[in-house]
């Protein structure tokens, strides 16, 4: 049914879905704090621009009796139930913030006439790609895939002189929501990653992973997994690892590597960690003070969602344009806005762009160091450390297939 939007006459409302199932187990109070902090900033920015308007948020809570698992895998209907609640109350804002679970976002997008913009902190899966009115403020799986393909093909760096075309992917089904969809994308036979690789096998059992580490007949030296160092240690322990094995540990939303006193454990020496570059300023606002590094990114995405709405509202009001139009709903993409922690860029499909950082462990200092950075906006890799102190032979990354030496400068498709 057509729901009237509280979105005109100088009063603009944001509908925030507060769902029991969420991409990160974050207390809803922290998300509320993030939203409220964002509102304060937006009000200040609009006032500074001479726009005398009211901006508020309405928090829509789902029925905890029905949807109380807290698990994204069971979230398919929760978003729709919340939309029904909004519809019954005849109370829809100019923009919808939340949901964060891929299943619920996909279902909501499918089953509703979205004439308003939807901003998500999450929705990582490929099924939420290329949605015309959906904006995602945490790196989706597509961005990870493009990095991996770019890095695999790279063969002209001092520390990587071989193109790679093979990989194992470790995926045991217990992953967090972000990891679940990242690995799902790598596993999908129709995905860009699968298309570009000659060989890819998914390891689903701990023992499969452990056996590969010293298997002379392995088909690839490269293993991709997703999670933190502790997750890797549980799996790998102190087992011996063949000298030309490279583990790529995807751990995007974890700032712990960038704490000054962190020393890399010994089991990380064969590992390259892919994470996001920390912001230029440390968050010390009320909502982030007590958050773990991962959850800070999640709460920050909510806050930035509010700032993004404020940015678009300001532009449309200054141009004298109507907010409750398809034009507004489709405008939340291909732009840069001032986020809480610096400029935030959205690509042509409304997905956040970021700088990914690939870290290695220095054998000299046992500290994490930046090997290279990758700009998702331009799909380009920038080497930082031209002479890394790797554990691998000659301080170069090995070939992905043992004994395939002579082909090292060829691209494999």
């Amino acid at each position: 049914s057509q729901v009237s939007q509280n979105c005109h006459n100088g009063s603009y409302e944001i509908s925030v879905l507060m769902m029991g199932n969420s991409a990160f187990a974050e207390p809803l109070k922290n998300l509320e704090d993030a939203v409220n902090e964002g509102l304060e900033i937006v009000r200040g920015r609009l006032q500074n621009a001479g726009l005398n308007v009211t901006v508020n948020a309405t928090f829509m809570y789902s029925d905890g009796l029905i949807h109380n698992s807290g698990d994204c895998r069971s979230s398919t209907c929760e978003g729709l139930d919340l939309l029904r609640k909004i519809s019954n109350a005849q109370r829809m804002g100019c923009v919808l913030i939340g949901p964060s679970c891929t299943y619920s976002t996909f279902q909501m997008y499918l089953d509703t006439e979205l004439s308003y913009p939807m901003i998500s902190a999450g929705s990582f899966g490929l099924s939420c790609d290329y949605k015309e009115t959906l904006t995602r403020l945490m790196s989706p799986a597509r961005k990870l895939m493009y990095f991996l393909v770019n890095f695999w093909k790279t063969n002209d760096l001092p520390f990587k002189t071989y193109s790679w075309s093979t990989s194992y992917v470790y995926k045991n089904g217990t992953e967090t929501e972000d990891c679940f969809w990242y690995l799902n994308a790598l596993e999908a036979s129709v995905s860009y990653f699968s298309h570009e690789l000659g060989f890819k096998v998914v390891l689903r059992q701990d023992k499969e992973f452990q056996d590969i580490l010293m298997d002379h007949n392995r088909k690839s030296n490269v293993i991709i997994m997703c999670g933190g160092p502790e997750f890797l240690y549980k799996l790998k322990g102190d087992r011996a690892v063949a000298e030309d094995i490279v583990i790529i540990l995807v751990d995007l939303f974890n700032d712990q590597y960038f704490e000054d006193n962190v020393t890399a454990p010994d089991y990380m020496k064969n590992v390259l960690v892919l994470t996001l570059s920390p912001g230029n300023s440390l968050l010390n606002s009320s909502f982030s003070r007590n958050l773990s590094p991962t959850k800070r990114d999640f709460a920050l995405a909510y806050l930035n969602g509010i700032l993004l709405f404020g940015h678009m509202l300001k532009i449309f009001l200054e141009n004298g344009e109507n907010i409750t139009t398809p034009k507004f709903a489709h405008a939340f993409r291909n732009l840069t806005f001032e986020g809480y922690d610096g400029p935030v860029t959205l690509d042509d499909w409304g997905d956040v762009d970021s700088t990914m950082v690939l870290l290695y462990t220095s054998v000299d200092t046992k500290k994490y160091k930046v090997l290279l950075t990758y700009d998702t906006h331009v799909n380009k890799t920038y080497p930082v450390d031209m002479s890394p102190t790797f554990t691998w032979k000659n301080s170069k990354l090995p070939n992905d297939i043992t004994g395939r030496g002579p082909q090292h400068h060829h691209h494999h498709h």
Partner: nanobody, 123 residues
Framework: EVQLVESGGGLVQPGGSLRLSCAAS????????IGWFRQAPGKEREGVIC???????KYADSVKGRFTISRDNAKNTLYLQMNSLRAEDTAVYYC?????????????????WGQGTMVTVSS
């Protein structure tokens, strides 16, 4: 004696590229945070880019996406790759080093400075 020597400056057309080098002696670059600064004629000196001792690059908004920084510890040299150069990039470029207190943040001030290299962007 601690020394930083910049090179690679010159005249380049708008849209062109240059690669500046900063060779260090008397200390190991790897242990230091390194910054590139520039001073245009009649203007204040401004920070362009910094590489923390952990290797994290931080850019001024004006050069993001155009300039990149890298370090070769084997040669004890830092590089600044400048692409898509504009007239407003014309300046003397200095490199500076600071014994790092934080591995991931740029220092508030730098202890050692090079003598600078001139970059002119003009058609």
């Amino acid at each position: 004696e601690v020394q930083l020597v910049e090179s690679g400056g010159g005249l380049v057309q708008p849209g062109g590229s240059l690669r500046l080098s900063c060779a260090a002696s008397g200390f190991t670059l790897d242990d230091y945070a390194i910054g590139w600064f520039r001073q245009a004629p009649g203007k204040e000196r401004e920070g362009v880019i910094c590489l923390t001792s952990g290797g994290l690059p931080k850019y001024a908004d004006s050069v993001k996406g155009r300039f990149t920084i890298s370090r070769d510890n084997a040669k004890n040299t830092l590089y600044l790759q400048m692409n898509s150069l504009r007239a407003e990039d014309t300046a003397v470029y200095y490199c500076a080093a600071s014994g790092a207190t934080s591995r991931w943040n740029c220092p508030p001030q730098y202890d050692h400075w090079g003598q600078g290299t001139m970059v002119t962007v003009s058609s």
